[in-house]
C-alpha cells in the first residue's frame, strides 16, 4: 500500500502552501525506501537516495516555479511514480446569506471569502435551535444537524424544506480543501429573512369617465403558500411618464383606485409586498404597468367595484399623492374588497 | 509593491451621489474580498460594506443599506463604492481594505475624504 | 449587530510602562478579535489578528490574549512610536464592528 495519504482531490496530485515548506511522498514505494527525485521532463537530479528523508522530497518555501510533475524513482532504476505539485492555501470561511420567498422554505447562498487555487468543496448542514428553558433567553443547538441539500449542478445554493416560521436555525457552510476545512456558521430565522416575491399579474385601467382615476390590480405571487395564517400587505407607487418621482400608497387589498392621476398621460404603476405583520423586508417591486386615464365625462353612476377617494376631478396635480391607506387588512381571499365601510363591518 | 489607493472622494451636497475607487496593485486583486471602512471626523472606524472575489455576495451595514452599492472589476483590479442619497452623516473618510478570512483587514489605502455639506 | 466596547477610553504612560487595554463584545465571538493601531492622520494597522497572532512585522512588544467575550491587548513597554489610538474588531459576524477606540499617549 502507498506511504501517501491522499488528500482530497484528483488522484496523483498533492498539495502545499506558498512561502511554506513542502514534502512531497513517493507513492509507489514503501513507507523510508531511499528515491530519487527528478522533474518531469528534466535530466537534473533534485534530491539523491542518500538524503536521508526516505520516500519523500522536501521543498523549502515552494513558490509558483515548483508547481508540476515530479518524478520519484527507487534504487534499482524503477518508476516510484510521478505525483503533480499544486500550490495554494487552506479554506477561508465562506460568506453565507440566506432567504426566504415564504414562511416555510429558506435558501442559502455561499461564495468563498478567498479564493484559495485549489480543489473545493462544500459542506453543508443545519440545526434547528431551541430555547433554554422557560426563562432563559439562552438558546442552544438542539436537534440535527441535518443536510441542508445542496442544489445540483453545482450551484452554490441549498434549501431548507420545511421550516418553521418561529424557529431558528443555525446553517454551517463548510469550505473545504486539500489543505484544511473551515466553518461558516450563521443564525437565521425566517422572520427576519423573509422576503416575498413581487406580486404578479399587475393590471392597470382606466375608470371610464373619470380622467383623473386608474384603477390597478394585481395578485399574490405564485411562490407564497394559500393559508389564511399569513399575509401580505401591499405598497403601490405610480407616476406620470416623464415625471421622476413616485406617489406611494398602500392598498388595503388586491386593487387601487388612484384619484389624482394627470389626465391624458400615460402612468406607470408598480406594486411590492411584505408580510402584513412586517417580518422581513419588502420585496423588490414588480416590473411596472402602464396606464391612460380615459377621456370623456363623468357618469352618474359610481362604479360599484370601485375603492374610490371621495376628491373632485379637478385640475391635474402632478405632486399630490394620494393619502395612505390602512396596511393591515385580512387575506384577500377571505374578504370582499368591493366597499371599504363593508370590510369595517366585517372587521368589527 | 502591495498597495490600495482611493480616489473619488471630495464636497457634494445632500441628496447627492458620489463614486469612490479603490485601484489595487501589488497582490493578485481577483483572489480576495475587498471592503469599504469609514471614519467620520474625530470618530472611529465604521465597517461600510464588503464584496466577495467574484462578486456575488455582498454585505452592507445597515447605515448605508439601500443608499450605497459596492462593486468590483476583476479586469481592472478595482473596487468601487457608489453612494447614493447622500446624508451629513456620510462625511467621512473612505478607506479601501483587503482582508484575510473576510473580517481581518491586513491592507489599507489611505483613505480619501468625503464632505457632504450645503 | 454584535457591539465592542473597549476601555479605557484613554489613557497615559510612561516610557517603557506596561500597557493593557480591555475590549468586550456583546455576544461570544470565539477568537475572532483583531486589534488595529493608527496615528493622526494615517490608515490602521493590524497588529493583532484572531485574538493573539502577532501580524508579520509587528514588534513582539505587543501581544493579545482572550476568547469568547473578554479579550486583552497588552503593550510590554511602551515606545514613544506608540502614541496612537487602539481599536479592537471582531470578525465572527460577517458584518465586521469595531470598538470605539482607545487613545494611548505619553506621560
Known amino acids: 500500500s502507498s506511504p501517501c495519504p491522499q488528500a482530497w482531490g484528483p488522484p496523483g496530485v498533492q498539495y502545499g502552501q506558498p512561502g511554506r515548506s513542502v514534502k512531497l511522498c513517493c507513492p509507489g514505494v514503501t513507507a523510508g525506501d531511499p528515491v530519487s527525485w527528478f522533474r518531469d521532463g528534466e535530466p537534473k537530479l533534485l534530491q539523491g537516495p542518500d538524503s536521508g528523508l526516505g520516500h519523500e522530497l522536501v521543498l523549502a518555501q515552494a513558490d509558483s516555479t515548483d508547481e508540476g510533475t515530479y518524478i520519484c524513482q527507487t534504487l534499482d532504476g524503477a518508476l516510484g511514480g510521478t505525483v503533480t505539485l499544486q500550490l495554494g492555501y487552506p479554506p477561508a470561511r465562506p460568506v453565507v446569506s440566506c432567504q426566504a420567498a415564504d414562511y416555510e422554505n429558506f435558501s442559502c447562498t455561499w461564495s468563498p471569502s478567498q479564493i484559495s487555487g485549489l480543489p473545493t468543496r462544500y459542506l453543508t448542514s443545519y440545526r434547528k435551535k431551541t430555547v433554554l428553558g422557560a426563562d432563559s433567553q439562552r438558546r442552544s443547538p438542539s436537534t440535527g444537524p441535518w443536510p441542508c441539500p445542496q442544489d445540483p449542478l453545482g450551484a452554490a445554493r441549498c434549501v431548507v424544506h420545511g421550516a418553521e416560521f418561529w424557529s431558528q436555525y443555525r446553517i454551517n457552510v463548510t469550505e473545504v480543501n486539500p489543505l484544511g476545512a473551515s466553518t461558516r456558521l450563521l443564525d437565521v430565522s425566517l422572520q427576519s429573512i423573509l422576503r416575498p416575491d413581487p406580486p404578479q399579474g399587475l393590471r392597470v385601467e382606466s375608470v371610464p369617465g373619470y380622467p383623473r382615476r386608474l384603477r390597478a390590480s394585481w395578485t399574490y405571487p405564485a411562490s407564497w403558500p394559500c393559508q389564511p395564517h399569513f399575509l401580505l400587505k401591499f405598497r403601490l407607487q405610480y407616476r406620470p411618464a416623464q415625471h421622476p418621482a413616485w406617489s406611494t400608497v398602500e392598498p388595503a387589498g388586491l386593487e387601487e383606485v388612484i384619484t389624482d392621476a394627470v389626465a391624458g398621460l400615460p402612468h406607470a404603476v408598480r406594486v411590492s409586498a411584505r408580510d402584513f405583520l412586517d417580518a422581513g423586508t419588502w420585496s423588490t417591486w414588480s416590473p411596472e404597468a402602464w396606464g391612460t386615464p380615459s377621456t370623456g365625462t363623468i357618469p352618474k353612476e359610481i362604479p360599484a367595484w370601485g375603492q374610490l377617494h371621495t376628491q373632485p376631478e379637478v385640475e391635474p396635480q402632478v405632486d399630490s399623492p394620494a393619502p395612505p391607506r390602512p396596511s393591515l387588512q385580512p387575506h384577500p381571499r377571505l374578504l370582499d374588497h368591493r366597499d371599504s365601510v363593508e370590510q369595517v363591518a366585517v372587521l368589527a | 509593491e502591495v498597495q490600495l489607493l482611493e480616489s473619488g472622494g471630495g464636497l457634494v451636497q445632500p441628496g447627492g451621489s458620489l463614486r469612490l475607487s479603490c485601484a489595487a496593485s501589488g497582490f493578485t486583486f481577483s483572489w480576495y474580498s475587498m471592503t469599504w471602512v469609514r471614519q467620520a471626523p474625530g470618530k472611529g472606524l465604521e465597517w461600510v460594506s464588503s464584496i466577495v472575489p467574484y462578486g456575488d455576495l455582498t454585505q452592507y451595514a445597515d447605515s448605508v443599506k439601500g443608499r450605497f452599492t459596492i462593486s468590483r472589476d476583476n479586469s481592472k483590479n478595482t473596487l468601487y463604492l457608489q453612494m447614493n442619497s447622500l446624508r451629513a452623516e456620510d462625511t467621512a473618510v473612505y478607506y479601501c481594505?483587503?482582508?484575510?478570512?473576510?473580517?481581518?483587514?491586513?491592507?489599507w489605502g489611505r483613505g480619501t475624504l468625503v464632505t457632504v455639506s450645503s | 449587530d454584535i457591539q465592542m466596547t473597549q476601555s479605557p477610553s484613554s489613557l497615559s504612560a510612561s516610557v517603557g510602562d506596561r500597557v493593557t487595554i480591555t475590549c468586550q463584545a456583546s455576544q461570544d465571538i470565539n477568537n475572532y478579535l483583531n486589534w488595529y493601531q493608527q496615528k493622526p492622520g494615517k490608515a490602521p494597522k493590524l497588529l493583532i489578528y484572531d485574538a493573539s497572532n502577532l501580524q508579520t512585522g509587528v514588534p513582539s512588544r505587543f501581544s493579545g490574549s482572550g476568547s469568547g467575550t473578554d479579550f486583552t491587548f497588552t503593550i510590554s513597554s511602551l515606545q514613544p512610536e506608540d502614541i496612537a489610538t487602539y481599536y479592537c474588531q471582531q470578525h465572527e459576524s460577517q458584518s465586521p464592528t469595531f470598538g470605539p477606540g482607545t487613545k494611548v499617549d505619553i506621560k
Open positions: 481594505a483587503k482582508p484575510e478570512d473576510w473580517g481581518r483587514f491586513d491592507l
